[in-house]
Interface confidence: medium
Protein backbone atom coordinates (compact mmCIF):
# COMPACT_ATOMS: atom_id res chain seq x y z
CA UNK A 1 0.00 0.00 0.00
CA UNK A 2 1.03 3.47 -0.98
CA UNK A 3 2.92 6.09 2.11
CA UNK A 4 0.59 9.03 2.32
CA UNK A 5 1.70 12.56 2.60
CA UNK A 6 -0.69 15.44 3.14
CA UNK A 7 -0.33 19.15 2.18
CA UNK A 8 -2.65 22.05 2.80
CA UNK A 9 -3.62 23.87 -0.88
CA UNK A 10 -1.48 26.95 -1.63
CA UNK A 11 1.48 25.23 0.29
CA UNK A 12 4.47 23.34 -1.73
CA UNK A 13 3.70 19.49 -1.19
CA UNK A 14 7.20 17.38 -1.23
CA UNK A 15 6.76 13.57 -2.37
CA UNK A 16 10.22 12.29 -0.69
CA UNK A 17 12.25 9.56 -2.53
CA UNK A 18 15.93 8.67 -2.16
CA UNK A 19 18.71 6.43 -3.68
CA UNK A 20 22.38 6.04 -3.11
CA UNK A 21 24.33 7.17 -6.43
CA UNK A 22 27.72 4.72 -7.08
CA UNK A 23 29.21 7.58 -7.58
CA UNK A 24 28.05 11.22 -8.13
CA UNK A 25 29.21 11.79 -11.99
CA UNK A 26 27.06 8.79 -13.64
CA UNK A 27 23.24 9.12 -12.35
CA UNK A 28 20.80 6.52 -12.56
CA UNK A 29 17.43 7.55 -14.52
CA UNK A 30 14.72 8.77 -12.63
CA UNK A 31 11.24 9.47 -13.51
CA UNK A 32 8.02 11.26 -11.63
CA UNK A 33 4.81 9.96 -13.08
CA UNK A 34 0.90 10.70 -11.80
CA UNK A 35 -0.60 7.93 -10.86
CA UNK A 36 0.79 4.32 -9.89
CA UNK A 37 3.84 2.83 -11.42
CA UNK A 38 2.89 1.11 -14.30
CA UNK A 39 5.10 -2.20 -15.80
CA UNK A 40 7.55 0.00 -17.21
CA UNK A 41 8.84 3.71 -17.21
CA UNK A 42 6.15 6.25 -15.57
CA UNK A 43 2.79 7.02 -16.72
CA UNK A 44 1.49 11.60 -17.29
CA UNK A 45 5.36 11.94 -16.37
CA UNK A 46 6.12 15.11 -14.60
CA UNK A 47 9.99 15.49 -14.42
CA UNK A 48 12.78 12.83 -15.36
CA UNK A 49 16.47 13.05 -14.84
CA UNK A 50 19.30 11.55 -16.69
CA UNK A 51 22.54 10.41 -16.15
CA UNK A 52 23.60 13.73 -15.09
CA UNK A 53 20.83 16.00 -14.95
CA UNK A 54 16.81 17.25 -15.00
CA UNK A 55 15.73 16.72 -18.70
CA UNK A 56 12.03 17.24 -18.53
CA UNK A 57 9.92 18.86 -15.89
CA UNK A 58 6.03 20.51 -16.01
CA UNK A 59 5.49 23.49 -14.21
CA UNK A 60 5.12 23.51 -10.60
CA UNK A 61 7.34 20.20 -10.36
CA UNK A 62 10.57 20.56 -9.34
CA UNK A 63 13.91 19.08 -7.41
CA UNK A 64 14.71 20.65 -4.75
CA UNK A 65 17.03 18.79 -2.49
CA UNK A 66 20.36 17.71 -4.20
CA UNK A 67 19.66 14.78 -6.89
CA UNK A 68 23.25 14.58 -8.01
CA UNK A 69 23.60 12.85 -4.54
CA UNK A 70 20.29 11.01 -4.93
CA UNK A 71 17.91 13.18 -3.03
CA UNK A 72 14.96 12.93 -6.26
CA UNK A 73 12.20 13.99 -4.11
CA UNK A 74 9.18 15.55 -5.65
CA UNK A 75 8.32 19.38 -5.06
CA UNK A 76 4.97 20.53 -6.18
CA UNK A 77 4.12 24.02 -6.15
CA UNK A 78 1.53 25.70 -4.52
CA UNK A 79 -1.20 22.44 -4.69
CA UNK A 80 -4.89 22.20 -4.97
CA UNK A 81 -7.11 19.82 -4.59
CA UNK A 82 -6.75 18.42 -8.30
CA UNK A 83 -3.29 17.78 -6.92
CA UNK A 84 -4.30 14.56 -5.22
CA UNK A 85 -3.92 11.25 -5.81
CA UNK A 86 -0.85 8.50 -6.36
CA UNK A 87 2.40 9.42 -7.36
CA UNK A 88 5.36 7.40 -8.97
CA UNK A 89 8.93 7.81 -8.36
CA UNK A 90 10.74 4.91 -10.16
CA UNK A 91 14.46 4.62 -10.00
CA UNK A 92 15.21 3.42 -13.59
CA UNK A 93 18.26 0.98 -12.38
CA UNK A 94 19.70 -0.90 -15.73
CA UNK A 95 19.00 -4.25 -16.41
CA UNK A 96 15.83 -6.35 -17.25
CA UNK A 97 13.26 -5.39 -14.37
CA UNK A 98 15.59 -4.24 -12.07
CA UNK A 99 13.84 -0.64 -11.47
CA UNK A 100 12.38 0.33 -7.99
CA UNK A 101 9.67 1.50 -7.57
CA UNK A 102 7.49 3.56 -4.84
CA UNK A 103 4.17 4.75 -4.62
CA UNK A 104 3.58 7.96 -2.62
CA UNK A 105 0.17 9.04 -2.17
CA UNK A 106 -0.94 12.80 -1.84
CA UNK A 107 -3.86 14.32 0.32
CA UNK A 108 -4.55 17.58 -0.21
CA UNK A 109 -6.48 19.36 2.73
CA UNK A 110 -8.64 22.77 1.79
CA UNK A 111 -6.85 25.73 3.79
CA UNK A 112 -8.26 26.79 7.21
CA UNK A 113 -7.52 29.84 6.06
CA UNK A 114 -6.02 31.56 3.07
CA UNK A 115 -2.63 30.49 3.61
CA UNK A 116 0.36 32.47 2.56
CA UNK A 117 2.73 29.78 0.18
CA UNK A 118 4.79 27.96 2.57
CA UNK A 119 7.64 25.50 2.06
CA UNK A 120 6.60 24.03 5.72
CA UNK A 121 5.97 19.47 4.75
CA UNK A 122 2.68 17.69 6.58
CA UNK A 123 3.74 13.94 7.38
CA UNK A 124 1.71 11.81 8.10
CA UNK A 125 4.20 8.94 7.64
CA UNK A 126 7.59 7.40 8.33
CA UNK A 127 9.41 4.29 7.40
CA UNK A 128 12.69 3.60 8.34
CA UNK A 129 15.34 4.01 5.84
CA UNK A 130 19.30 3.90 5.21
CA UNK A 131 21.45 6.51 3.13
CA UNK A 132 25.12 5.58 2.87
CA UNK A 133 27.79 7.08 1.05
CA UNK A 134 30.55 4.79 -0.05
CA UNK A 135 33.06 4.15 -2.59
CA UNK A 136 33.23 3.34 -6.48
CA UNK A 137 33.89 -1.12 -6.24
CA UNK A 138 33.33 -3.88 -8.60
CA UNK A 139 29.43 -4.04 -7.42
CA UNK A 140 28.69 -0.68 -8.77
CA UNK A 141 30.40 -1.67 -11.73
CA UNK A 142 28.20 -4.37 -12.48
CA UNK A 143 25.46 -2.66 -11.62
CA UNK A 144 25.53 0.51 -13.62
CA UNK A 145 28.51 -0.11 -15.61
CA UNK A 146 30.89 2.63 -16.98
CA UNK A 147 31.21 5.34 -13.51
CA UNK A 148 33.87 7.45 -12.54
CA UNK A 149 36.21 5.91 -10.02
CA UNK A 150 36.04 7.90 -6.69
CA UNK A 151 38.96 7.58 -4.20
CA UNK A 152 38.79 7.89 -0.43
CA UNK A 153 38.80 12.01 -0.37
CA UNK A 154 36.23 12.02 -2.79
CA UNK A 155 34.48 9.59 -0.69
CA UNK A 156 35.05 11.90 2.60
CA UNK A 157 34.34 14.63 0.70
CA UNK A 158 31.15 13.80 -0.05
CA UNK A 159 30.28 12.19 3.24
CA UNK A 160 30.67 15.86 4.26
CA UNK A 161 28.80 17.60 1.66
CA UNK A 162 25.95 14.91 2.91
CA UNK A 163 25.88 16.18 6.35
CA UNK A 164 26.08 19.27 5.55
CA UNK A 165 23.71 19.78 3.14
CA UNK A 166 19.92 20.00 3.23
CA UNK A 167 19.82 16.28 2.53
CA UNK A 168 20.85 15.39 6.23
CA UNK A 169 17.62 17.07 7.25
CA UNK A 170 15.58 15.12 4.92
CA UNK A 171 17.36 12.00 6.42
CA UNK A 172 15.12 12.58 9.65
CA UNK A 173 11.77 13.03 7.65
CA UNK A 174 10.11 10.17 6.27
CA UNK A 175 10.68 8.89 2.78
CA UNK A 176 11.67 6.15 0.44
CA UNK A 177 15.70 4.94 -0.25
CA UNK A 178 17.09 2.47 -2.16
CA UNK A 179 20.90 1.73 -1.94
CA UNK A 180 22.34 1.21 -5.34
CA UNK A 181 24.96 -1.51 -5.77
CA UNK B 1 48.66 19.42 -11.81
CA UNK B 2 45.45 19.97 -14.01
CA UNK B 3 46.50 21.59 -17.12
CA UNK B 4 44.19 21.55 -19.98
CA UNK B 5 45.88 22.81 -23.14
CA UNK B 6 44.12 23.94 -26.26
CA UNK B 7 45.00 24.55 -29.97
CA UNK B 8 45.80 27.62 -31.62
CA UNK B 9 43.75 29.91 -33.53
CA UNK B 10 41.70 30.08 -36.04
CA UNK B 11 40.94 31.97 -38.97
CA UNK B 12 37.36 30.15 -41.09
CA UNK B 13 35.31 30.95 -43.89
CA UNK B 14 31.70 30.82 -43.25
CA UNK B 15 30.67 27.33 -44.22
CA UNK B 16 33.89 26.10 -43.48
CA UNK B 17 34.12 23.21 -39.96
CA UNK B 18 36.34 24.23 -37.13
CA UNK B 19 37.73 21.35 -34.90
CA UNK B 20 39.62 22.58 -31.45
CA UNK B 21 41.17 20.21 -28.77
CA UNK B 22 42.13 20.49 -25.45
CA UNK B 23 44.70 18.18 -24.24
CA UNK B 24 44.35 16.97 -20.74
CA UNK B 25 47.17 16.43 -17.81
CA UNK B 26 47.50 15.58 -14.43
CA UNK B 27 44.70 13.80 -13.76
CA UNK B 28 42.89 10.69 -14.84
CA UNK B 29 40.93 11.76 -18.37
CA UNK B 30 38.16 9.41 -17.68
CA UNK B 31 37.24 10.37 -14.40
CA UNK B 32 35.73 13.32 -15.22
CA UNK B 33 33.36 15.25 -17.75
CA UNK B 34 34.48 17.64 -20.33
CA UNK B 35 32.20 20.99 -21.38
CA UNK B 36 33.05 23.03 -23.87
CA UNK B 37 31.99 26.69 -23.58
CA UNK B 38 31.96 29.00 -25.97
CA UNK B 39 32.46 33.54 -25.73
CA UNK B 40 31.88 35.70 -28.24
CA UNK B 41 33.72 38.97 -28.54
CA UNK B 42 32.48 41.35 -25.11
CA UNK B 43 30.21 38.76 -24.73
CA UNK B 44 28.55 35.67 -22.09
CA UNK B 45 29.34 32.52 -21.65
CA UNK B 46 27.66 29.89 -23.80
CA UNK B 47 27.68 26.26 -23.01
CA UNK B 48 28.05 23.98 -25.90
CA UNK B 49 28.01 20.58 -24.41
CA UNK B 50 29.61 18.01 -22.94
CA UNK B 51 31.39 14.28 -23.23
CA UNK B 52 32.25 11.90 -21.03
CA UNK B 53 35.09 10.18 -22.44
CA UNK B 54 34.77 6.92 -20.15
CA UNK B 55 31.94 5.64 -22.14
CA UNK B 56 31.96 8.64 -24.96
CA UNK B 57 28.65 9.68 -23.37
CA UNK B 58 27.72 13.18 -24.94
CA UNK B 59 24.88 16.02 -24.73
CA UNK B 60 24.52 18.83 -26.94
CA UNK B 61 23.29 22.14 -26.89
CA UNK B 62 19.95 22.22 -28.52
CA UNK B 63 20.89 25.18 -29.96
CA UNK B 64 24.15 23.44 -31.79
CA UNK B 65 22.32 20.04 -32.60
CA UNK B 66 23.60 19.09 -36.03
CA UNK B 67 26.64 21.34 -36.20
CA UNK B 68 28.66 20.39 -33.03
CA UNK B 69 30.71 16.82 -32.30
CA UNK B 70 32.18 16.10 -29.38
CA UNK B 71 35.15 13.12 -29.11
CA UNK B 72 37.87 12.00 -27.34
CA UNK B 73 41.00 10.35 -27.87
CA UNK B 74 41.41 8.10 -24.49
CA UNK B 75 44.91 6.87 -25.65
CA UNK B 76 46.42 11.05 -25.69
CA UNK B 77 43.84 12.26 -23.25
CA UNK B 78 42.57 14.75 -25.56
CA UNK B 79 38.83 15.75 -26.15
CA UNK B 80 38.06 17.08 -29.40
CA UNK B 81 35.18 19.62 -30.65
CA UNK B 82 33.76 20.16 -33.91
CA UNK B 83 31.63 22.53 -35.19
CA UNK B 84 30.44 22.69 -38.56
CA UNK B 85 28.65 25.42 -40.91
CA UNK B 86 30.39 27.80 -39.26
CA UNK B 87 28.80 31.24 -39.07
CA UNK B 88 29.92 34.59 -38.30
CA UNK B 89 28.48 34.78 -35.13
CA UNK B 90 30.23 32.34 -34.55
CA UNK B 91 33.15 34.27 -33.56
CA UNK B 92 34.20 33.28 -30.53
CA UNK B 93 36.76 32.17 -27.58
CA UNK B 94 36.21 28.45 -27.36
CA UNK B 95 36.83 26.86 -24.08
CA UNK B 96 37.64 22.94 -23.08
CA UNK B 97 36.88 23.07 -19.17
CA UNK B 98 36.45 19.96 -16.64
CA UNK B 99 33.57 18.76 -14.82
CA UNK B 100 34.79 19.81 -10.91
CA UNK B 101 36.56 17.38 -8.52
CA UNK B 102 33.79 18.36 -6.05
CA UNK B 103 30.87 18.66 -8.64
CA UNK B 104 30.93 17.21 -11.62
CA UNK B 105 28.83 20.21 -12.80
CA UNK B 106 31.00 22.75 -12.56
CA UNK B 107 34.25 23.58 -13.74
CA UNK B 108 37.26 23.63 -11.51
CA UNK B 109 39.31 24.12 -14.54
CA UNK B 110 39.42 25.65 -18.06
CA UNK B 111 41.76 25.51 -21.18
CA UNK B 112 43.05 28.61 -22.19
CA UNK B 113 40.77 29.14 -25.32
CA UNK B 114 40.95 28.68 -28.59
CA UNK B 115 40.14 31.74 -30.96
CA UNK B 116 38.05 30.97 -33.90
CA UNK B 117 37.10 33.97 -36.38
CA UNK B 118 34.66 33.38 -39.12
CA UNK B 119 35.05 35.81 -41.91
CA UNK B 120 34.86 35.62 -45.54
CA UNK C 1 16.05 26.78 -20.88
CA UNK C 2 16.56 28.34 -18.07
CA UNK C 3 16.91 32.30 -18.28
CA UNK C 4 19.97 32.71 -15.18
CA UNK C 5 18.87 37.34 -14.91
CA UNK C 6 22.02 38.36 -13.52
CA UNK C 7 22.07 42.43 -11.41
CA UNK C 8 23.54 44.58 -11.49
CA UNK C 9 25.84 44.69 -14.92
CA UNK C 10 28.46 47.24 -13.54
CA UNK C 11 29.00 47.70 -10.08
CA UNK C 12 31.06 50.49 -9.06
CA UNK C 13 33.35 49.23 -6.03
CA UNK C 14 36.04 50.74 -3.76
CA UNK C 15 39.22 49.00 -1.98
CA UNK C 16 37.52 47.71 0.69
CA UNK C 17 33.35 47.73 -0.26
CA UNK C 18 31.03 45.20 0.81
CA UNK C 19 29.21 44.25 -2.24
CA UNK C 20 26.27 41.60 -3.56
CA UNK C 21 25.08 40.46 -6.86
CA UNK C 22 22.69 38.57 -8.12
CA UNK C 23 21.55 35.98 -9.98
CA UNK C 24 17.66 34.85 -10.76
CA UNK C 25 16.51 31.86 -12.29
CA UNK C 26 13.72 31.19 -14.79
CA UNK C 27 12.65 28.58 -12.33
CA UNK C 28 13.53 26.68 -9.44
CA UNK C 29 17.05 25.25 -10.02
CA UNK C 30 17.72 24.09 -6.62
CA UNK C 31 21.48 24.72 -5.20
CA UNK C 32 23.12 23.85 -8.50
CA UNK C 33 24.80 27.48 -9.30
CA UNK C 34 27.86 28.01 -9.53
CA UNK C 35 29.94 32.04 -9.50
CA UNK C 36 32.80 32.44 -11.25
CA UNK C 37 35.47 35.10 -11.57
CA UNK C 38 37.19 36.08 -15.24
CA UNK C 39 39.86 38.99 -15.75
CA UNK C 40 40.10 40.31 -19.23
CA UNK C 41 41.73 38.24 -21.14
CA UNK C 42 42.03 35.23 -19.03
CA UNK C 43 39.99 32.18 -18.63
CA UNK C 44 36.88 31.96 -15.64
CA UNK C 45 37.94 30.98 -12.71
CA UNK C 46 35.44 29.01 -10.23
CA UNK C 47 34.86 30.84 -7.13
CA UNK C 48 31.83 28.95 -5.50
CA UNK C 49 29.98 25.58 -6.38
CA UNK C 50 26.01 24.53 -5.26
CA UNK C 51 25.62 27.52 -4.33
CA UNK C 52 27.43 28.40 -1.17
CA UNK C 53 30.95 26.13 -0.95
CA UNK C 54 33.39 28.31 -1.77
CA UNK C 55 36.38 25.86 -4.09
CA UNK C 56 39.68 25.16 -2.66
CA UNK C 57 42.14 28.02 -2.05
CA UNK C 58 39.25 30.64 -2.61
CA UNK C 59 39.52 33.20 -0.07
CA UNK C 60 36.78 33.43 2.43
CA UNK C 61 35.90 36.99 1.61
CA UNK C 62 33.92 35.43 -1.56
CA UNK C 63 30.59 33.84 -0.26
CA UNK C 64 27.24 32.81 -2.21
CA UNK C 65 23.73 31.81 -0.64
CA UNK C 66 20.67 31.10 -1.78
CA UNK C 67 18.89 28.31 -3.21
CA UNK C 68 15.51 27.59 -5.74
CA UNK C 69 15.50 30.82 -7.73
CA UNK C 70 17.33 33.41 -5.82
CA UNK C 71 21.05 33.49 -5.39
CA UNK C 72 23.23 35.96 -4.07
CA UNK C 73 27.07 36.37 -4.71
CA UNK C 74 29.20 38.82 -1.84
CA UNK C 75 32.32 40.25 -1.85
CA UNK C 76 33.12 40.95 1.98
CA UNK C 77 35.93 43.30 1.56
CA UNK C 78 37.24 44.03 -2.43
CA UNK C 79 40.71 43.81 -2.97
CA UNK C 80 42.30 45.11 -5.88
CA UNK C 81 42.85 42.08 -7.51
CA UNK C 82 39.41 41.27 -7.24
CA UNK C 83 38.00 43.73 -10.35
CA UNK C 84 36.72 41.37 -12.96
CA UNK C 85 33.53 39.75 -14.05
CA UNK C 86 31.52 37.68 -12.49
CA UNK C 87 29.19 35.24 -13.98
CA UNK C 88 26.85 32.84 -12.26
CA UNK C 89 26.07 29.56 -14.17
CA UNK C 90 22.87 27.09 -13.26
CA UNK C 91 23.64 23.45 -13.54
CA UNK C 92 19.91 21.65 -12.73
CA UNK C 93 19.10 21.00 -16.49
CA UNK C 94 21.15 21.43 -19.96
CA UNK C 95 21.35 23.49 -21.47
CA UNK C 96 23.92 24.94 -18.65
CA UNK C 97 23.28 28.66 -19.12
CA UNK C 98 24.79 31.11 -17.30
CA UNK C 99 24.10 35.21 -16.57
CA UNK C 100 25.32 38.23 -18.66
CA UNK C 101 27.94 39.14 -16.05
CA UNK C 102 28.26 41.60 -13.38
CA UNK C 103 31.45 43.89 -14.00
CA UNK C 104 33.55 45.14 -10.81
CA UNK C 105 34.83 49.13 -11.70
CA UNK C 106 36.89 51.33 -9.71
CA UNK C 107 34.41 54.00 -8.39
Known amino acids: SEVEYRAEVGQNAYLPCFYTPAAPGNLVPVCWGKGACPVFECGNVVLRTDERDVNYWTSRYWLNGDFRKGDVSLTIENVTLADSGIYCCRIQIPGIMNDEKFNLKLVIKPAKVTPAPTRQRDFTAAFPRMLTTRGHGPAETQTLGSLPDINLTQISTLANELRDSRLANDLRDSGATIRIG | QVQLVQSGAEVKKPGASVKVSCKAS????????MDWVRQAPGQGLEWLGY????????SYNQKFKGRVTMTTDKSTSTAYMELRSLRSDDTAVYYC?????????????WGQGTTVTVSS | SIVMTQTPKFLPVSAGDRVTMTCKAS??????VAWYQQKPGQSPKLLIY???NRYTGVPDRFTGSGSGTDFTFTISSVQVEDLAVYFC?????????FGTGTKLEIK
Open chain 3, 89 to 97: QQHYSSPYT
Open chain 3, 27 to 32: QSVGNN
Open chain 2, 26 to 33: GYTFTDYY
Open chain 2, 51 to 58: IYPNNAGT
Open chain 2, 97 to 109: ARGGYYSYYSYDY
Open chain 3, 50 to 52: YAS
